[in-house]
């Protein structure tokens, strides 16, 4: 079945050294346990996190994200997942793309992370 992938339309903000969540979901909501789900960074498609065959595929990760990411899967049965990145670095700033692949059908959503210096940070909004 077909679906859309939805991510944050507003930039996600994080402080250096903190953790940040990048949420992503499919619509209409459906069980994504059997799908391939991942995040990569354009333009060179460096793998930030990959989930396939019901498991996190740590071996496919770009070295700079090894040990810093966690896929929150408690709502994957509804097609909702979140990538948590720990110990945020300035180099994490920029674009991320989340994708869901169901057999040969794949959709994705782009999102943006803004990283700020904690000594010069003003709460957004």
């Amino acid at each position: 079945g077909q679906f859309r992938v939805i991510g944050p339309r507003h930039p996600i903000r994080a402080l250096v050294g903190d953790e940040v969540e990048l949420p992503c979901r499919i619509s209409p909501g459906k069980n994504a346990t059997g799908m391939e789900v991942g995040w990569y960074r354009p333009p060179f498609s460096r793998v930030v996190h990959l989930y396939r065959n019901g498991k996190d595929q740590d071996g496919d990760q770009a070295p700079e994200y090894r040990g810093r990411t966690e896929l929150l899967k408690d709502a994957i049965g509804e097609g909702k997942v979140t990538l948590r990145i720990r110990n945020v670095r300035f180099s994490d700033e920029g674009g991320f793309t989340c994708f869901f692949r169901d057999h040969s059908y794949q959709e994705e959503a782009a999102m943006e992370l803004k990283v700020e210096d904690p000594f010069y940070w003003v709460s957004p909004g």
């Epitope: 339309r9 996600i12 953790e19 969540e21 949420p23 619509s27 909004g125």
Partner: antibody, heavy 119, light 107 residues
């Protein structure tokens, strides 16, 4: 099952302060964004504030910016709303509600707690 | 900020009627729109998300449509328990604004 229970409402004088709490259970609290929504007597719904799962991002309606502070304690599965410099127009039922990462509608709501600002 | 304008603000209908409520956004919000039902003294209940997807457990007589700026909630055959106030909400961007509500009462 998912449950959200608000507390801390009551009668307060204009200019006063109040802290609302929302105790969450039945889900992985730290993995969800949380919101406060209010409803003045006989009026419609007004979104007030939101906070990300980690607490690192917060958002406010213009009507409360600089006066209200949203926070959360993930170790206690509790959401808070610190309300300062209260005005008569802040009188409302305050609901907490969860959403998924700020990219979903509010699928679970608490029962609400009434805040009355009056002298 | 994105404003949502619902119409009508109230309507009277009979059991079995087809009821349509519209919600117009001041700027495009893709499909990031939800519809809620609220009864007096109760918290709102999610009916429709992503403009047209039915929330689990909600009767199929409720449906939503639209994209961009114009959205519709339809109740195909009004039931006694459907007399309530209905709100649209956008979650495209903060602040996550609500429409002013549409009260559906008995004719």
């Amino acid at each position: 099952q998912v449950q959200l229970v608000e507390s801390g409402g009551g009668l307060v004088q204009p200019g006063g302060s109040l802290r609302l709490s929302c105790a969450a259970s039945g889900f992985a609290f730290r993995n969800y964004a949380m919101n406060w929504v209010r409803q003045a007597p006989g009026k419609g719904l007004e979104w007030v504030s939101a906070i990300s799962g980690s607490g690192g991002s917060t958002y406010y309606a213009d009507s409360v910016k600089g006066r209200f502070t949203i926070s959360r304690d993930n170790s206690k599965n509790t959401l808070y709303l610190q309300m300062n410099s209260l005005r008569a127009e802040d009188t409302a039922v305050y609901y907490c509600a969860r959403d998924y990462g700020g990219i979903s509608p509010f699928d679970y709501w608490g029962q609400g707690t009434l805040v009355t600002v009056s002298s | 900020d994105i404003q949502l304008t619902q119409s009508p603000s109230s309507l009277s209908a009979s059991v079995g009627d087809r009821v349509t409520i519209t919600c117009r956004a001041s700027q495009g919000i893709s499909s990031a729109l939800a519809w809620y039902q609220q009864k007096p003294g109760k918290a709102p209940k999610l009916l429709i998300y992503d403009a047209s997807s039915l929330e689990s457990g909600v009767p199929s007589r409720f449906s939503g449509s639209g994209s961009g700026t114009d959205f519709t909630l339809t109740i195909s055959s009004l039931q006694p328990e459907d007399f309530a106030t209905y709100y649209c909400q956008q979650f495209n961007s903060y602040p996550h604004t609500f429409g002013q509500g549409t009260k559906v009462d008995i004719k």
